[in-house]
């Protein structure tokens, strides 16, 4: 039997400078594309190698992005969220939620779609 899986949730402000190829990550989520059950939030699904986010090093796959330049990402359609990032300017401030898995007992399995990465 697997041990209990707990999560440590932390928030962080990440300031990125848009690089030659942009911010360098992919997102999933939105009111029309729920990636996590009962949660229409926006999550990072991919960090592009050598992109701005990868070079900064703080943004991780599985992170939930709460706001962009102070604008809340709640209740947005997926494409509206994408467009918000694309139009966010050169200096982009992200409020993100990291969800770190903490194991108690035997290691469990984290499946695809689990926001912890």
């Amino acid at each position: 039997m697997n041990g209990r899986v707990d999560y440590l949730v932390t928030e962080e402000e990440i300031n990125l400078t848009r690089g030659p190829s942009g911010l360098g990550f992919n997102i999933v989520g939105g009111t029309d594309q729920q990636y996590v059950s009962n949660d229409s939030g926006i999550y990072v699904s991919r960090i592009k190698e050598n992109g701005a986010a990868a070079l900064d090093g703080r943004l991780q796959e599985g992170d939930k992005i709460l706001s962009v330049n102070g604008q809340d990402l709640k209740n947005l359609l997926h494409q509206d969220a994408v467009d918000l990032f694309r139009n966010a300017g050169y200096a982009v401030s992200l409020r993100v939620q990291h969800r770190l898995q903490v194991q108690n007992g035997p290691i469990g399995h984290r499946g695809e779609g689990d926001p912890s990465g």
């Epitope: 992919n26 999933v28 594309q33 991919r46 992109g51």
Partner: nanobody
Framework: EVQLVESGGGLVQAGGSLRLSCTAS????????MAWFRQAPGKEREFVAA??????YYADSVKGRFTISRDNAKNTVYLQMNSLKPEDTAVYYC?????????????????????WGQGTQVTVS
Amino acid sequence: EVQLVESGGGLVQAGGSLRLSCTASGRTFSTYTMAWFRQAPGKEREFVAAISWSGTYYADSVKGRFTISRDNAKNTVYLQMNSLKPEDTAVYYCTAVIGSTVDSYSPSDPLEYDYWGQGTQVTVS
């Protein structure tokens, strides 16, 4: 890890049709951006078509002849190929990435995608 399995290739006469299928693993298939590339012997890999959350994209060489579509309930993306020409002969590869890029999307750039299938041979005689 996303697994992609292509099927539907074969030998067809010029002017004929084929429908390629690509079935993907994973329970969040609807969030995947999917594409088809092809590679003919001695030639570079070439973009064919892509389907993202926001729409579909085609290479000029196949526009009006090929149609990309998806069935999220079946975790499958399709490439309907009509009016096939001998120059369409190639190995066709399915590719995918989870989510949508927040940057300008370049569907024909192989670096946009993380996962690749093994390919299916299409021969037009």
